[in-house]
Interface confidence: medium
């Protein structure tokens, strides 16, 4: 997987009036990294991992950049002509990637009220838009505004591409984010489900990257999908991920079941703990 930096900026308008606040979230390699939720914001590192990447006293730069980007997006929202009554949002998502072969990708996407209406490849400067007439009207409106000062636009988007990659490389230099493998901690618990049955839950946490196989096996054979319930693979705030899988089994059959985990080429199996059922809850 490539290394990536993703900026997600959102500004709001109410009855055609652009609000002063904005929300910016930054994800590094898919992990929540920075958050800025006031006009005069402090960029808030999302967990110790982000602080380790940023190092001491380097958040001013991020705060300045994110605040500037928020102002630019508010100006763009002010130029959208079909503002209707009520609450509306304009969202800009900007992503840059560095692949293993050192090639790069950069793109920018605009959403109005959650609907994608305009995208740009920041390397080729190629614009694309959906087919719907509303999206096309919005897209022309925004694109024309962004092109009003052609010189500014050219330098602006070149800078956006270059700055994003520069920031990504700077974060990678910290060494904390460099492509790494962190194996999961796997924990199996059991809880009473109904008379004669127990729910067994297998949790994997603290792993990186996010790709993981977690499933229940009976007699060494994977259970069918419809007999298992999976949790989402979610960031845990430490630059790593967590997930779970659960199934219901007959009490007394525990030794026939294993939780199978595969991650980054390594795999392991984990037994159902024996003993009394202490937790009275059910995932179903």
């Amino acid at each position: 997987e490539p290394h990536s930096l993703r900026y997600n900026l959102t500004v709001l308008s109410w009855d055609g009036s652009v609000q002063s606040g904005f929300l910016t979230e930054v994800h590094l390699d898919g992990q929540p990294f920075l958050r800025c939720d006031r006009q005069k914001c402090r960029a808030k590192p999302q967990g110790q991992w982000a602080e380790d990447v940023l190092g001491n006293k380097t958040w001013d730069r991020e705060t300045r950049d994110l605040t500037g980007n928020g102002k630019d997006l508010r100006m763009t929202l002010a130029h959208i002509k079909d503002q209707k009554e009520g609450l509306h949002s304009l969202q800009e998502i900007r992503v840059c990637e560095i692949h293993e072969d050192n090639s790069t990708r950069s793109s920018q996407h605009f959403y109005y009220d959650g609907e994608l209406f305009l995208s740009q490849n920041l390397e080729t400067k190629e614009w694309t838009m959906p087919q719907s007439s509303r999206a096309q009207t919005l897209a022309m409106n925004v694109r024309n505004f962004l092109k009003e000062d052609a010189m500014k636009t050219k330098t602006h988007y070149h800078a956006m591409h270059a700055d994003c990659l520069q920031e990504l490389r700077r974060y990678l230099k910290s060494g904390v984010v460099l492509r790494r493998t962190v194996p999961p901690m796997v924990n199996v618990t059991r809880s009473e489900a109904s008379e004669g049955n127990i729910t067994v839950t297998c949790r994997a946490s603290g792993f990186y990257p996010w790709n993981i196989t977690l499933s229940w096996r009976q007699d060494g054979v994977s259970l069918s999908h419809d007999t298992q319930q999976w949790g989402d693979v979610l960031p845990d705030g430490n630059g790593t991920y967590q997930t779970w899988v659960a199934t219901r089994i007959c009490q007394g059959e525990e030794q026939r079941f294993t939780c199978y985990m595969e991650h980054s080429g390594n795999h392991s199996t984990h037994p159902v703990p024996s003993g009394k059922v202490l937790v009275l809850q059910s995932h179903w």
Partner: antibody, heavy 115, light 108 residues
Amino acid sequence: DVQLQESGPGLVKPSQSLSLTCTVTGYSITSDYAWNWIRQFPGNKLEWMGFVSYSGTTKYNPSLKSRISITRDTSENQFFLQLNSVTSEDTATYYCARGYGFDYWGQGTTLTVSS
Amino acid sequence: EIVLTQSPTTMAASPGEKITITCSATSSISSIYFHWYQQRPGFSPKLLIYRTSNLASGVPARFSGSGSGTSYSLTIGTMEAEDVATYYCQQGTTIPFTFGSGTKLEIK
């Protein structure tokens, strides 16, 4: 490739104890599955004797429960059968096998109980 | 314990013939805990069909299995010389796990 290999004395005197070893290669006995002892009598009847599971749980055939013990050595990836107070009725070929649907078997070791 | 009764005890078949072996249980068995084994003369038993109807690795497609509850069967679509063996059914639903008494298949 998973392989199981039984080893044992071949001849045991009545009333003595029988000890057999199953050495597993190509798969860790702590990873998954049950690790079984099965025997086949001279008339070809098969009898499941018991297992030790990957987690260390043991289950035995009630007909042998007072005489049988299955243990393991995880560092050597081996599991063992001990059968006490043997008689001529225990003369059989003894197999170790993996799983519940026994997908891998050893080649078997023939045990004769005779004075 | 669950007793498995196989029939026939022995049978002889010509090459190309269709063969069916049945296994009847004294109590209902979960289909995921029912298996068939083949034992050729002088060899260890070999898993043939697992979980009632799934062919074990390397088993030819002429073998098939079916059944549920207390009644299960093994079918050889077209008998071949290499199929000469004793066939055993086995249940893993309840302890003790038990085997059928075997069906010895010979070639005419």
